[in-house]
Interface confidence: low
Amino acid sequence: DAHKSEVAHRFKDLGEENFKALVLIAFAQYLQQCPFEDHVKLVNEVTEFAKTCVADESAENCDKSLHTLFGDKLCTVATLRETYGEMADCCAKQEPERNECFLQHKDDNPNLPRLVRPEVDVMCTAFHDNEETFLKKYLYEIARRHPYFYAPELLFFAKRYKAAFTECCQAADKAACLLPKLDELRDEGKASSAKQRLKCASLQKFGERAFKAWAVARLSQRFPKAEFAEVSKLVTDLTKVHTECCHGDLLECADDRADLAKYICENQDSISSKLKECCEKPLLEKSHCIAEVENDEMPADLPSLAADFVESKDVCKNYAEAKDVFLGMFLYEYARRHPDYSVVLLLRLAKTYETTLEKCCAAADPHECYAKVFDEFKPLVEEPQNLIKQNCELFEQLGEYKFQNALLVRYTKKVPQVSTPTLVEVSRNLGKVGSKCCKHPEAKRMPCAEDYLSVVLNQLCVLHEKTPVSDRVTKCCTESLVNRRPCFSALEVDETYVPKEFNAETFTFHADICTLSEKERQIKKQTALVELVKHKPKATKEQLKAVMDDFAAFVEKCCKADDKETCFAEEGKKLVAASQAALGL
């Protein structure tokens, strides 16, 4: 339904607080280097303008699109060219090209200082002194570092962030109360950002059809009692929400997400029996809860899939009449019966089924041709099952840190051209699949593991796209969204790689390593491990293990020494020499 003033419409729907927060997120995700104060000023100007439009929708400029209004506002930033370079050229374009241009300049790895958490007392004082600014700063800092963060979900995180400070700054032991909550928000936030980044990549790189297929599979697993028409309606609405958020249309996205939550709760009887608790919560919690809700129980006595999709004489007729609807029904029926499969596996099965029908429905005897199509599924199902079994065994044997190290070596040998920080970050995240998923029973392992790996490998893909260095990574990332993980799994050692020159500086350590947290110390050691493999890609596991054990002993020894810096200097030289000898460098 058309509104005379889109900005007034969204302001009224969302309310001033959410409107301001979402505009701040939008601006921070576009102009990631701008100071906080500049963004607050822009947001206040947009808000004041929106209020004039609420008062009189016919007022000057109130009929302009949100992209036009926001883009014009962003283009008033005086330092645009010196701060962002060619992004300033976007301002010479007209909508919708201008917004597309801004989107293309979003940076997944912006050059921003690492967020350092201050003392609890500092944070509590800041929170009490100016709660509004403190919370805005949180939105700003997260949004600029995660330019695809799902905006309505970030409002939910901010609400929890505020609740944590409200509660803990009054507690007897503020730190004991607050720090675990902040750790949890940080970890959940990183996971949420990565999951949303995959959704946006799916839409932007592979198109709406790919995203809709993913949504059909996931929602069918989650709501197996809902009928196909209901799932299709939810998929259409969900696709609109994510298309808007990924496109920077955050006000529309948040508004439509609220409408979708309302619809789901009004129709929960025909969707899922698991929604009752979610639907009693306030809006932000409700939407989050629905997105995370557990799978409903499968209906009893579901008939065999073969009847409609293999044995029926109408298979090719039904397929020809409405290909995507028929394939959607196949995906829906298969997914609701298989909560034990990963979404990407279900999509591979649907793709195999589609390819078979394309070939067979043009054959002399279609039925004879596609009669054994379900047999083709067996190896596709067994491949991830076997991989997960092997890797969970390895994880249980090694523990998380050493399992990460095994993956670091594996992936550095596959794609040694990728930057060391990216290899460390991605391999550490890949390694977390162990503690995240291996504890689950068989029936939950694959959806947990393979869908999580899809999220992590997408991080590799988006980081690599910014600075492409490996044809093999580009190939695995771009050929097929659902086959990314099998593509990376199938990569062997890159025989074309010319080993990196040895540089002693890379393996020089100082006393500051002793004061690092366990996690940061692990990252330092894992960085050294990647560099070792880049110098000596043919090194055996045993050689690398020996060097890493020596390295750990060296760090432990020097951190206990009275003169730490001298120990690191002298013992470090010996370690480098011994490592070179051990690896034949």
Epitope: P35, P113, V116, P118, E119, T125, D129, N130, K137
Partner: nanobody
């Protein structure tokens, strides 16, 4: 308002040392996070080090870790930066900064008050 005055800059040879001081007046010093930033000719201002109110936390830029040490004496309303193993690339105007409420120590926009700077030149 808080006034900050830096001192201790000068010319030093590579490998040499200096100790910078920053004296604060006009506020309750012990309630401020204190930071040092620097700006080399033709470059942007960059974070060097910071220290929390009660010296519980210190933070350093990667480029100075292990060489520079930040400390404070709340009884003297002074923050110090000890510069060791100086290199030519450390040449810059060093600024002291104070922040009443900071979320992120390393960001210059978080700091409310700034000194005029003291020049450090590392040259042979």
């Amino acid at each position: 308002d808080v006034q900050l005055v830096e001192s201790g800059g000068g010319v030093v040879q590579p490998g040499g040392s200096l100790r910078l001081s920053c004296a604060a007046s006009g506020g309750t010093f012990s309630t401020y996070v204190m930071g040092w930033f620097r700006q080399a000719p033709g470059k942007e201002r960059e974070f060097v080090a910071a220290i929390s109110q009660n010296s519980i936390h210190t933070y350093y830029a990667d480029s100075v870790k292990g060489r520079f040490t930040i400390s404070r004496d709340n009884s003297k309303n002074t923050v110090y930066l000890q510069l060791n193993s100086l290199r030519p690339e450390d040449t810059a105007l060093y600024y002291c900064a104070a922040s009443r409420f900071t979320s992120w120590y390393t960001a210059d926009y978080e700091y409310d008050y700034w000194g005029q700077g003291t020049l450090v030149t590392v040259s042979s």
